[in-house]
């Protein structure tokens, strides 16, 4: 005889508000074997029991969350297993304060992650990352759990909030921090993130401090992601100072993203282009000064931006954007520096 | 030159009340994050408090939560410890400190103030 | 919490000896590390921030290292006014927290 359950998985994590089945079925040589779950606030409906199986029907309600077995007996022969069921609830619902920060000032932000469940600090981290890596000299303040104000009676979802005050930002500062909370889950993790940008100054800033004179790349999302993957979580590396970050993109994997190459032989003219397949364009947005005083081309996945008059091109960040997807690259172009390119 | 001066400690019941203050010079002291660190007789140092520097933020440490408050006057660059229900365990040298903007560790420190709790 | 575990508690040395202390973090405090010189009676001094940056005035025969969760404060020839109590503290994340301090004393 054989005992078989489906899936096969001791744990099983169930976003709120999906079904899952399990299934569990027995084959007895000697007549019709006695399958049936205990161990579960099973109310009506939620197990189907036919000859030789049983199916235990979860439907993603917080109360579902416990641990199931499943018993088959086959004549004097018996086997059980166990499924242990997490109910979780982890929306997309990132909030962060204040919408954008000040260069230059002592600062705290704070993100929010709304409607969570289970609030377990041990589930739940958060991060503040300068591009991909986590921001170095941030100091995390106490985190904060408060229970989500519910229309309807059941289990209450909880809102966990992370503050962090901020080391000084660099010169200049990058484009973007973003908040990146990630839910830790048997067989599953789960991120969503949300861009906090930086209130970029008017006046041109000061190169950064790097060793040449080389331009300098921050790649930045405009847009939050959810992303799920196995149990093979690559942890994100402690990165350096912002100063000392090298004038690269510092973005290897992820979303492709748009490239900026300088043309010295074009007087001072900058190329964004995009390789991500049809259908995406790119266009300029963001420039030292007004964006409108630039002589600009846009053709589809490419588009070139140059100074009128001609000449030296202005210090300061250049940004360009991709879409579909919002996806940009910044360039920080330091005064009269050798032509380099973002790739 | 910068200063920080404790004073209010004493000696009080269990039970009891007692406001610290520590009076700051030689800085602007409303751009700086200020901190409560404590020591008991012949033990190490153990965080209290901290307050923003524009009291916009504070935090305790579990030890005292609910009991202590920590306050500032920027207009009159002082730091306070409202310290309610008293404890025993509360007896200690009391500091303040000052915390550097952007990094954060305690570069500045009060010549502390003796509490003592004792029936 | 995050704990800080100094080592040793206490030690025994020289005038012009080498002398070092380590501290190690529950989890990883990054480069958030300060080490602070204590003597009895008086107020805690900031000798060392950000695990190896030497707080003006502090002479340079005092030096720390690491990073993460192992770091070392080493004085590298012991003056007469470095017999103190040294302590590690994180200001990573809140709350703050302190190693329970090493006393460096004439042997």
């Known amino acids: 005889q054989s005992f078989q359950v489906n899936p096969p998985e001791s744990e099983v994590a169930v976003a709120m508000g999906t079904s899952l089945q399990i299934t569990c079925s027995m084959s007895c040589d000697e007549g019709v074997a006695r399958v049936h779950w205990r161990g579960l606030d099973t109310s009506l409906g939620s197990v189907q029991t036919l000859p030789g199986s049983s199916i235990l029907s979860v439907r993603g309600m917080l109360s579902d969350t416990g641990t199931p077995v499943c018993v088959g007996s086959c004549g004097s022969r018996s086997f059980q297993h166990s499924v242990k069921i997490l109910v979780y609830a982890f929306p997309d619902q990132l909030v962060v304060s204040p919408e954008f920060l000040v260069p230059g000032q002592d600062q705290v932000v704070s993100c929010t992650a709304h409607n969570i469940w289970p609030a377990d600090p041990n589930s739940l981290s958060f991060a503040l990352l300068l591009g991909e890596q986590r921001l170095e000299g941030a100091q995390a303040l106490e985190p904060e759990q408060e229970e989500e104000i519910q229309e309807a009676e059941g289990t209450p979802l909880f809102r966990m909030t992370q503050r962090w005050r901020l080391p000084s930002l660099g010169t200049p500062a990058p484009p973007a921090l973003h908040c990146q909370v990630t839910m830790q889950l048997p067989k599953l993790v789960l991120t969503h993130r949300k861009e906090i940008p930086v209130l970029q100054s008017q006046t041109s800033p000061k190169p950064p401090n790097t060793t040449s004179a080389e331009p300098y790349i921050l790649t930045s999302s405009s847009t939050a992601e959810a992303v799920s993957t196995g149990l093979n979580i690559t942890t994100l590396p402690s990165a350096p100072p912002y100063p000392k970050l090298s004038p690269r993109t510092l973005s290897s994997e992820g979303p492709c993203r748009p490239k900026i190459h300088q043309d010295l032989e074009a007087g001072w003219e900058l190329l964004c282009e995009a390789s991500c397949g049809p259908g995406v364009t790119v266009r300029w947005t963001l420039a030292p000064g007004d964006l409108a005083t630039y002589h600009k081309r846009e053709a589809g996945a490419q588009a070139w931006l140059s100074v009128l008059p001609p000449g030296p091109m202005v210090e300061g960040w250049f940004q360009c954007r991709q879409d579909p997807g919002g996806e940009v690259t910044n360039l920080y172009v330091p005064g009269q520096v050798t032509p380099n390119s973002s790739s | 030159e910068v200063q920080l001066l404790e004073s209010g400690g004493g000696l009080v019941q269990p039970g009891g009340s007692l406001r610290l203050s520590c009076a700051a010079s030689?800085?602007?002291?409303?751009?700086?994050?200020m901190h409560w660190v404590r020591q008991a007789p012949g033990k190490g140092l153990e965080w209290i408090s901290y307050?923003?520097?524009?009291?916009?933020?504070?935090n305790y440490a579990d030890s005292v939560k609910g009991r202590f408050t920590i306050s500032r006057d920027n207009s009159k660059n002082t730091l306070y410890l409202q310290m309610n229900s008293l404890r025993a365990e509360d007896t200690a040298v009391y500091y303040c400190a000052r915390d550097r903007p952007y990094y954060y560790y305690m570069d500045v420190w009060g010549k502390g103030t003796t509490v003592t709790v004792s029936s | 919490d995050i704990q800080m575990t100094q080592s040793p508690s206490s030690l025994s040395a020289s005038v012009g000896d080498r002398v070092t202390i380590t501290c190690r973090a529950s989890q990883s405090v990054s480069r958030s590390l300060a080490w602070y010189q204590q003597k009895p009676g008086k107020a805690p001094k900031l000798l060392i921030y950000a695990a190896s940056s030497l707080q003006s005035g502090v002479p340079s025969r005092f030096s720390g290292s690491g990073s993460g969760t192992d770091f070392t404060l080493t004085i590298s020839s012991l003056q007469p006014e470095d017999f103190a109590t040294y302590y590690c503290?994180?200001?990573?994340?809140?709350?703050?927290?302190f190693g329970q301090g090493t006393k460096v004393e004439i042997k």
């Open positions: 503290q994180q200001y990573k994340s809140y709350p703050v927290t």
């Open positions: 307050i923003s520097g524009s009291s916009g933020y504070t």
């Open positions: 030689g800085f602007t002291f409303s751009d700086f994050w």
